[in-house]
Interface confidence: medium
């Protein structure tokens, strides 16, 4: 499938529009702190020059891949060694360097403004008066800022908010309208970026195979009726798109994922009876449905496991002929049978099947030492049942607030020196497992719960690996992908940690915190809960609770006074001295 | 000075409720916090609820989702309602009146008290 020119099929394969895009994104991910003008201009360049190359693909330059276009062109930005430093140093090196160079650093928590929102009627006035650029902002800046957004599902994410803009701006109450579409798309938009980041993280950080058993486990999970061959095929195609994206080839990602729709949808009898409503939609709704589609219903006269898995004979046989294949058969009759299990859980079942086969088939009777291997997976499943069990009992009792503050407490006790901003975005994300999974029935939680938390604790690895702080926190992301939330859930009270100084600016507040929105006003006090813990780790959660509540009291109070500034530090200086009191300071 | 006076206690069967009242008299307390203690034999006294100034509440933990604290401004009176009431709640229950509002879950942080009602729950 060799084409003269790879930009001109491209470009001929995605359209224009769907080109520019993509490049856009791939540059503003690429270069996260250039001008937007900066990243239209270059993008303009290469489109012209692919639109050179559908005329005549033998035309000079039009042979060169798109990673020698696309760094060359990065490379001539003008201001690249006083904006990105070291980065600069990239483009002394050839392909394919140059790209790996690039994608090393790209950084997840880049220093860029918080977007703040402009009025409604502002928003309105833009859009109408220059739709494409609008848009085009929003992709750059969902892209900058989140360097690893998988980018044909930003395509879709983008259809979404010109819709909002449409539909809303003509509405009578436009802000009613569009509001709440806007944050739908906000908090859809974060989770969608991080369940990317951790695709990302276990190709780059754990490879292929670890991503590929990811994969079978998961799509047999959604398509129980497919045979092993089918999801092998599935699994293969999925890996090569989510390889491409998270490589930064978006061109050939966003074509191989509408390629793979394509084939999902024109073999669905043979994949999953719950495809039907997805494959009538248009091309990035076909295939945003397709990735969050159901489970299907499971065959309804499955044999039992052991059979082929224990009691056969062939085991070590089998295992032996091809053992990836073999692990990945028991993967898959695993995954189809349980969707009530988590992808991490399967995983750890498959990965400690694999073990006692390396053991057993070395023994002098296999059979007999692999024959019990089933009774190893009852306490791997029973641990993840009964944590969420708990924590949901908790979430319950608490609700999400105060389940975060208690997450809080734990994981700043763990991990002390993670920095307090990376400590209450990720405990906060951690609490929000209450809302979104605890209200699902027993056969759903924990696929709900353990695969969620397993994307949370991603941001808290790839955030840390940027600065890391804490032996601890590397150890329990680099040692296993599959066990990281078992390796967090262990860990105890960081019994090395020097507790940090009292610094009472850190605990001085200004009438500002009362015109913040109730989100912002949490993460305030949360923040000061964090900054309490790291300076008093063995306060007690009796001890902590009460210093909270002397906090929330200070807040209300001196956001109903008269001289709110006045209050803050009068009464600021008050609560300083019963919280020092409080802890036994 | 301030006087304190509980009333409500008494015997209670375990899963079931007391109202115990604290009626204030000598100056108002408008800018203060009003709390519930309770203090078992041979124990130290302990935190049970407060109600400040603001009118912003805290629980123990051990009473949470229990036990109710309220207040009749003009009455100059603090209510616990005890609900779903176990053996381990038996006590000595006290108000406390204390001049800040902060520090409310400390003994310190009170600067009056009452004479405290006897609460007995039995199994």
């Known amino acids: 499938d060799a084409h003269k020119s790879e930009v001109a099929h491209r470009f001929k394969d995605l359209g224009e529009e769907n080109f520019k895009a993509l490049v856009l994104i791939a540059f503003a991910q690429y270069l996260q702190q250039c001008p937007f003008e900066d990243h239209v201009k270059l993008v303009n360049e290469v489109t012209e020059f692919a639109k050179t190359c559908v005329a005549d693909e033998s035309a000079e330059n039009c042979d060169k891949s798109l990673h020698t276009l696309f760094g060359d062109k990065l490379c001539t930005v003008a201001t690249l060694r006083e904006t990105y430093g070291e980065m600069a140093d990239c483009c002394a090196k050839q392909e394919p360097e140059r790209n790996e160079c690039f994608l090393q650093h790209k950084d997840d928590n880049p220093n860029l403004p918080r977007l703040v929102r402009p009025e409604v009627d502002v928003m309105c006035t833009a859009f109408h008066d220059n739709e494409e650029t609008f848009l085009k902002k929003y992709l750059y800046e969902i892209a900058r800022r989140h360097p690893y957004f998988y980018a044909p599902e930003l395509l879709f994410f983008a259809k979404r908010y010109k819709a909002a803009f449409t539909e809303c701006c003509q509405a009578a109450d436009k802000a009613a309208c569009l509001l709440p579409k806007l944050d739908e798309l906000r908090d859809e938009g974060k989770a969608s970026s991080a369940k990317q980041r951790l695709k990302c993280a276990s190709l780059q950080k754990f490879g292929e195979r670890a991503f590929k058993a990811w994969a079978v486990a998961r799509l047999s999970q959604r398509f129980p009726k497919a045979e092993f061959a089918e999801v092998s095929k599935l699994v293969t195609d999925l890996t090569k798109v989510h390889t491409e994206c998270c490589h930064g080839d978006l061109l050939e990602c966003a074509d191989d994922r509408a390629d793979l729709a394509k084939y999902i949808c024109e073999n669905q009898d043979s994949i999953s009876s719950k495809l039907k409503e997805c494959c009538e939609k248009p091309l990035l709704e076909k295939s945003h449905c397709i990735a969050e589609v159901e489970n299907d219903e499971m065959p309804a006269d499955l044999p039992s496991l052991a059979a082929d898995f224990v009691e056969s004979k062939d085991v070590c046989k089998n295992y032996a002929e091809a053992k990836d294949v073999f692990l990945g058969m028991f993967l898959y009759e695993y995954a189809r049978r349980h969707p009530d299990y988590s992808v991490v859980l399967l995983l750890r079942l498959a990965k400690t099947y694999e073990t006692t086969l390396e053991k057993c088939c070395a023994a002098a009777d296999p059979h007999e030492c692999y024959a019990k291997v089933f009774d190893e997976f009852k306490p791997l499943v029973e641990e993840p049942q009964n944590l969420i069990k708990q924590n949901c009992e908790l979430f319950e009792q608490l609700g999400e607030y105060k389940f975060q503050n208690a997450l809080l407490v734990r994981y700043t006790k763990k991990v002390p020196q993670v920095s307090t901003p990376t400590l209450v975005e990720v405990s906060r994300n951690l609490g929000k497992v209450g809302s979104k999974c605890c209200k699902h029935p027993e056969a759903k939680r924990m696929p709900c719960a353990e695969d969620y938390l397993s994307v949370v604790l991603n941001q808290l690895c790839v955030l840390h690996e940027k600065t890391p702080v804490s032996d601890r926190v590397t150890k329990c992301c680099t040692e296993s992908l599959v066990n990281r939330r078992p390796c967090f859930s262990a860990l105890e009270v960081d019994e090395t940690y020097v507790p940090k100084e009292f610094n009472a600016e850190t605990f001085t507040f200004h009438a500002d915190i009362c015109t913040l929105s109730e989100k912002e006003r949490q993460i305030k006090k949360q923040t000061a809960l964090v900054e309490l813990v790291k300076h008093k780790p063995k306060a007690t959660k009796e001890q902590l609770k009460a210093v909270m509540d002397d906090f929330a009291a200070f807040v209300e109070k001196c956001c109903k006074a008269d001289d709110k500034e006045t209050c803050f530090a009068e009464e600021g200086k008050k609560l300083v001295a019963a919280s020092q009191a409080a802890l036994g300071l | 000075d301030v006087q304190l006076v509980e009333s409500g206690g008494g015997l209670a069967q375990a899963g079931g409720s007391l109202r115990l009242s604290c009626a204030a008299s000598?100056?108002?307390?408008?800018?203060?916090?009003m709390g519930w203690f309770r203090q078992a034999p041979g124990k130290e006294r302990e935190f049970v609820a407060t109600?400040?100034?603001?009118?912003?509440?805290s629980y123990a933990t051990s009473v949470q989702g229990r036990f109710t604290v309220s207040r009749d401004i003009a009455k100059n009176t603090v209510y616990l309602e005890m609900n779903n009431l176990k053996p381990e709640d038996t006590a000595v229950y006290s108000c406390?009146?204390?001049?800040?509002?902060?520090?409310?879950?400390?003994?310190?942080?009170?600067?009056?008290w009452g004479q405290g009602t006897q609460v007995t729950v039995s199994s």
């Open positions: 406390g009146a204390g001049v800040s509002d902060y520090g409310c879950y400390r003994t310190s942080g009170y600067n009056y």
């Open positions: 000598g100056r108002t307390f408008s800018n203060e916090c």
């Open positions: 109600i400040r100034s603001t009118g912003h509440i």
